[in-house]
């Protein structure tokens, strides 16, 4: 079974410990990833002025980054646990290619970038165990991801900085929305 960051595998195996998918552990795990994103963003902001760019300017991009919408069933008003969980897992799977792109984008925070990527994989595994409707989860095509990765890496330096900033900000917002929804499950 996947082990959360900062957790001992023997704790996980203990007979009276909480199940791995308890909201407290998922909460802690998502916050661990959020902390990693913050560290990566500090490096990004220190080396470029992207963080000063207005949200509107950043919105003018052709990245198809996952986002929560009303129809996804993650807001309490139209809350649907199964639909929402599928959206969260699908979104995280879609972010994986972007997290792969980030791997060569950091110098001093290279390990942090890897930790964010690996922690996200572990989070996906946790949530897949929790999901009843695994058939509804669409995994991105490897060939599509490979061509997207090539395209992103071929951008000029300015666009790569912009892309890095956008991915980190969007991933943060997606994780925060996911955490709010998972708290209701």
């Amino acid at each position: 079974a996947p082990v959360l960051p900062g957790e001992d595998s023997k704790d996980v195996a203990a007979p009276h410990s909480q199940p791995l998918t308890s909201s407290e552990r998922i909460d802690k795990h998502i916050r661990y990833i959020l902390d990693g994103i913050s560290a990566l963003r500090k490096e990004t902001c220190n080396r470029s002025n992207m963080c000063e760019s207005s949200k509107e300017a950043l919105a003018e991009n052709n990245l198809n980054l996952p986002k929560m919408a009303e129809k996804d069933g993650c807001f309490q008003s139209g809350f649907n646990e199964d639909t929402c969980l599928v959206k969260i897992i699908t979104g995280l799977l879609e972010f994986e290619v972007y997290l792969e792109y980030l791997q060569n984008r950091f110098e001093s925070s290279e390990e942090q970038a890897r930790a964010v990527q690996m922690s996200t994989k572990v989070l996906i595994q946790f949530l897949q165990k929790k999901a009843k409707n695994l058939d509804a989860i669409t995994t991105p095509e490897p060939t599509t991801n490979a061509s997207l990765l090539t395209k992103l890496q071929a951008q000029n330096q300015w666009l790569q900085d912009m892309t890095t900033h956008l991915i980190l900000r969007s991933f943060k917002e997606f994780l925060q929305s996911s955490l709010r929804a998972l708290r209701q499950m």
Epitope: R31, L34, F75, Q76, S77, K172, E173, Q176, L179
Partner: antibody, heavy 122, light 111 residues
Framework: EVQLQESGPGLVKPSQTLSLTCTVS??????????WSWIRQPPGKGLEWMGV???????YYSPSLKSRTSISWDTSKNQFSLQLSSVTPEDTAVYYC??????????????WGQGTQVTVSS | NFMLTQPPSVSGTLGKTVTISCAGT?????????VSWYQQLPGTAPKLLIH???TRASGIPDRFSGSKSGNTASLTISGLRSEDEANYYC??????????FGGGTQLTVLG
């Protein structure tokens, strides 16, 4: 003990830009998962949320004020600021800065500044 | 300009119970469990009473309680005291990374 203190001009002319600063003591503005909001209260009226800057420096604004509002921070001084452009007399209010202790799953304000009165008049 | 709907004023008798309502939509109160309540005395900054619908802030007596049903939140004050006379505001998180306040309710405590 966290303390917030607003500062800025008490009188601003119509069409000008209102600039206010909130100085935070007793804790860093970059502490995860804190967020820092500006909230105003026109005379005799209710509270109006204007916008927020979170622990990463990300900003979000009230849809009704978005086009005129800008929030920024100076982490070296532990301050965050509000700029409201093209002001009119309707922007006359007491302006408060406030802290949200957990922007991920909190959304409440546990510490407030004492407020600063801003009047828009020629 | 979005605003949650509160009654402009309510009154209650010393020692009795009063409830203040706060009506919103599925995009704010109905959509999230992030409702908070504040007390504001004249000439002072608001003070946090309740957050996350029903959690009392540090140092707030259990005479103050919060609840929510659908798109409406409520603040209940029992054992009314004269010092409870103040303005009360509700607030809620709103899609997406926004917050919204109510118009405020003036509570009058009758002898």
């Amino acid at each position: 003990e966290v303390q917030l203190q607003e500062s800025g001009p008490g009188l601003v002319k119509p069409s000008q830009t209102l600039s206010l600063t909130c100085t935070v003591s007793g804790g860093s503005i970059t502490t995860r998962y804190y967020a820092w909001s500006w909230i105003r209260q026109p005379p005799g009226k209710g509270l109006e949320w204007m916008g927020v800057i979170d622990y990463d420096g990300d900003t979000y604004y009230s849809p009704s004020l978005k086009s005129r509002t800008s929030i920024s921070w100076d982490t070296s001084k532990n301050q965050f600021s509000l700029q409201l452009s093209s002001v009119t007399p309707e922007d006359t209010a007491v302006y408060y800065c406030a802290r949200d202790p957990d922007v991920v799953t909190g959304f409440h304000y546990d510490y407030w500044g004492q407020g600063t009165q801003v009047t828009v008049s020629s | 300009n979005f605003m949650l709907t509160q009654p402009p004023s309510v009154s209650g008798t010393l020692g009795k119970t009063v409830t203040i309502s706060c009506a919103g939509t599925s995009s704010d109160i109905g959509g999230y469990n992030y409702v908070s309540w504040y007390q504001q005395l004249p000439g002072t900054a608001p003070k946090l009473l309740i957050h996350r619908v029903s959690t009392r802030a540090s140092g707030i007596p259990d005479r103050f309680s919060g609840s929510k049903s659908g798109n409406t939140a409520s603040l209940t004050i029992s054992g009314l005291r004269s010092e409870d006379e103040a303005n009360y505001y509700c607030a809620s998180y709103r899609n997406f990374n926004n917050a919204v306040f109510g118009g405020g309710t003036q509570l009058t405590v009758l002898g």
